[in-house]
Amino acid sequence: PTGAVEVQVPEDPVVALVGTDATLRCSFSPEPGFSLAQLNLIWQLTDTKQLVHSFTEGRDQGSAYANRTALFPDLLAQGNASLRLQRVRVADEGSFTCFVSIRDFGSAAVSLQVAAPYSKPSMTLEPNKDLRPGDTVTITCSSYRGYPEAEVFWQDGQGVPLTGNVTTSQMANEQGLFDVHSVLRVVLGANGTYSCLVRNPVLQQDAHGSVTITGQPMTFPPEA
């Protein structure tokens, strides 16, 4: 409708690392003569309309979300209604709505995408001694405490993807972070290097692990 307050948020999701602070940007255009006494600002979870933080009756009413939110009080009068979310958790992921009411009202939703990098994979071999060409071995690649779920790729020493006989499992811990375990069953050649790559699809971060088998003995490359 003509004259309705226009609320603007980023189109792209805000990406925040677990444990860091995130700013959910939201702005409106104050009319000449605007004062904070006229402003009613509500931040809420989009899906449930549960209150997160509010500014009404000319003052900051505080956080209704585990005391981890804050506004930017010095910037409100210029139309900056952004919300600071502290110590981001996996459970915070989702859509937040910025609802602004002055003479009329408007709202817009911004998405928060939470991410956590995966640890450098550790590699284990079973069996791990007296290996000979033709033996079937199980190589396990384990990477921990990442988010969201990882993509896992295996390849041999020549860079040829290994897609058969791979089983990958991902388990979330109590914080919602994933531990990934990927198992490759392979028949040994005379010697060979087997690499796993654990990719965080949001951060576009790759964590690499590899194991080299040279008949006798077996060596692991040093940790990077």
């Epitope: 409708p1 309705a4 307050v5 609320v7 009613n40 509500i42 809420q44 989009t46 899906d47 449930t48 309309k49 549960q50 209150l51 009404t56 859509s95 709505t97 609802f99 009411s101 002055i102 003479r103 009329d104 009202f105 408007g106 709202s107 817009a108 939703a109």
Partner: antibody
Framework: QVQLVQSGAEVKKPGSSVKVSCKAS????????INWVRQAPGQGLEWMGG????????NYAQKFQGRVTITADESTSTAYMELSSLRSDDTAVYYC?????????????????WGQGTTVTVSS | DIQMTQEPSLTTSPGGTVTLTCRSS?????????ANWVQEKPGQAPRGLIG???KRAPGTPARFSGSLIGGKAALTITGVQPEDEAIYFC?????????FGGGTKLEIK
Amino acid sequence: QVQLVQSGAEVKKPGSSVKVSCKASGGTSGVALINWVRQAPGQGLEWMGGIIPLFGTANYAQKFQGRVTITADESTSTAYMELSSLRSDDTAVYYCARDQVVATSGVNFGMDVWGQGTTVTVSS
Amino acid sequence: DIQMTQEPSLTTSPGGTVTLTCRSSTGAVTTSNYANWVQEKPGQAPRGLIGGTNKRAPGTPARFSGSLIGGKAALTITGVQPEDEAIYFCALWYSNLWVFGGGTKLEIK
């Protein structure tokens, strides 16, 4: 349980105005949006505008801009919709419907409570 | 202007399952459109069935469910009852206003 009770039927002359009231009773806490929706004979539902009584702020559909005024009296839990410069095609049933800006229960039920409707007939 | 499209009419049988949809001219419907479904029967005021895409209003039977399917809002009635014969309107929220669809007349045969 919230209830919305609307004022009675009206017969109006073309060019005049009509003011319809909508009184909320029972558990009216929280930040509500009172919408006004009309239905002309044989037609669908049409959103005219809405008001947040707690804030006193209203929005209007472009079609009705300048011809409709929505107000609220927080002290009596009553919302009003005034439509001016009435024409014969404004003959309709006018409804108020509550939506929650903030869902105090933590569940967003949308426009879950409707008034019984007010018939407005515009005829010379 | 935002246009919303619903099936003008649908026919189903008692005990059957039927899905009504609501398409927006602005593109895919999302959770921030808070899709509402409203039931209207002759001589009665409209009744809110579903809000916030998939939340059943108090008193709405469990056979009614809301969802997003292929970028559209959807209302599914599982185990249709004769009393479900009515007109169903969807409504979507666009930042500061509601827009209603034209309604779907559901006939039970």
